[in-house]
């Protein structure tokens, strides 16, 4: 089959990293600089993706594979193939149209990206709050009071000096 196909189409013999050059009697020519072909039998090489500005080269282009971009420090990739770079925020913050803003009381974000999420409601699972939540961390739920045998003590954190989730300004 391969022999038959190559007799019909000489371009099928051109490997990845080359193209079938119609201007040179369908000879297999190497891809020019800044271009690639990832499969054999190509009649053209594709231009490489260029990572510039806020986009940073994660993987260089080669004759057989495209470049890959990520984002410069302080940004992270969004979208297919890292088509956007979104600004990082600190833990305990979320990105709004006006920049990074602290999580509201009762919410937290333990990452540099994404939105603030509500603390877990321990009582929905019949449990009690073992460790209070902050802007950066969810609450830790402990066993429900009913689960505690007589005489057993639950870990009670000291009362916070300020509302949990609020940092001093």
């Amino acid at each position: 089959f391969e022999r038959t196909r190559s007799l019909q189409d000489p371009c099928s013999n051109c490997p990845a990293g080359t193209f079938c050059d119609n201007n040179r009697n369908q000879i297999c020519s190497p891809c020019p600089p800044n271009s690639f072909s990832s499969a054999g039998g190509q009649r053209t090489c594709d231009i490489c993706r260029q990572c510039k500005g806020v986009f940073r080269t994660r993987k260089e282009c080669s004759s057989t594979s495209n470049a890959e971009c990520d984002c410069t420090p302080g940004f992270h990739c969004l979208g297919a193939g890292c088509s956007m770079c979104e600004q990082d925020c600190k833990q305990g913050q979320e990105l709004t149209k006006k920049g990074c803003k602290d999580c509201c009381f009762g919410t937290f974000n333990d990452q540099k990206r994404g939105i603030c999420r509500p603390w877990t409601n321990c009582s929905l699972d019949g449990k009690s709050v073992l460790v209070n939540g902050t802007k950066e961390r969810d609450v830790v739920c402990g066993p429900s009071p009913a689960d505690l045998s007589p005489g057993a003590s639950s870990v009670t954190p000291p009362a916070p000096a300020r509302e949990p989730g609020h940092s001093p300004q």
């Epitope: 800044n34 231009i47 993706r49 510039k52 500005g53 806020v54 986009f55 770079c85 600004q87 149209k97």
Partner: antibody, heavy 123, light 107 residues
Framework: EVQLVESGGGLVQPGGSLRLSCAAS??????????VTWIRQAPGKSLEWIGD???????YYSPSLKSRVTISRDNSKNTLYLQLNSLRAEDTAVYYC???????????????WGQGTLVTVSS | DIQLTQSPSSLSASVGDRVTITCRAS??????LNWYQQKPGKAPKLLIY???TLQSGVPSRFSGSGSGTDFTLTISSLQPEDFATYYC?????????FGQGTKVEIK
Amino acid sequence: EVQLVESGGGLVQPGGSLRLSCAASGFSLSTSGVGVTWIRQAPGKSLEWIGDIYHSGSTYYSPSLKSRVTISRDNSKNTLYLQLNSLRAEDTAVYYCAREGSDAVAGDWFDYWGQGTLVTVSS
Amino acid sequence: DIQLTQSPSSLSASVGDRVTITCRASQSISSYLNWYQQKPGKAPKLLIYAASTLQSGVPSRFSGSGSGTDFTLTISSLQPEDFATYYCQQYYSTPLTFGQGTKVEIK
């Protein structure tokens, strides 16, 4: 509020040079992730990218103009410049500067544009 | 260079019509495509970036779709202020390039 204001356009002799300015306000040219670009539009034609400069100072140019163009900036004045040499009739166009990115999301799109300045190359 | 070909070059439509403009790239550019609107004597205005993300402040009747080589800008219900010229732009590689434009005129 973000604003870009171009200046320096006018009538230029063929073979001459132009230096356009783009005064930016409402954001800093030296902020991480910020890029500013020059784009031109000949009368009745589409848009043509000339080149851009980033907060890091790195510049990128259109290969067709690279030998004649220089983009620079003055961070203290928050101003961008375009120098174009060996002018010819086909350089007649409205020249725009534009900010790249969009609020807290960065990329090679242009969210704020100046009003444009017309450059006419004629003897 | 990557060429962008828009179709149609111009179209006539009425207020309330659904309008679709296409942009075809000379090779795959993933989702690295933006759309702009330009009115006579004015600078272009960003509508859509990264193929489908609506720019802040742009009405939701505008939407973008596509990836690879074929992209679409759709105006779900044309308004009087939408009569303008629309351009696509790629940022896959330099030189950044624009389509030739599609002029949307009143029928």
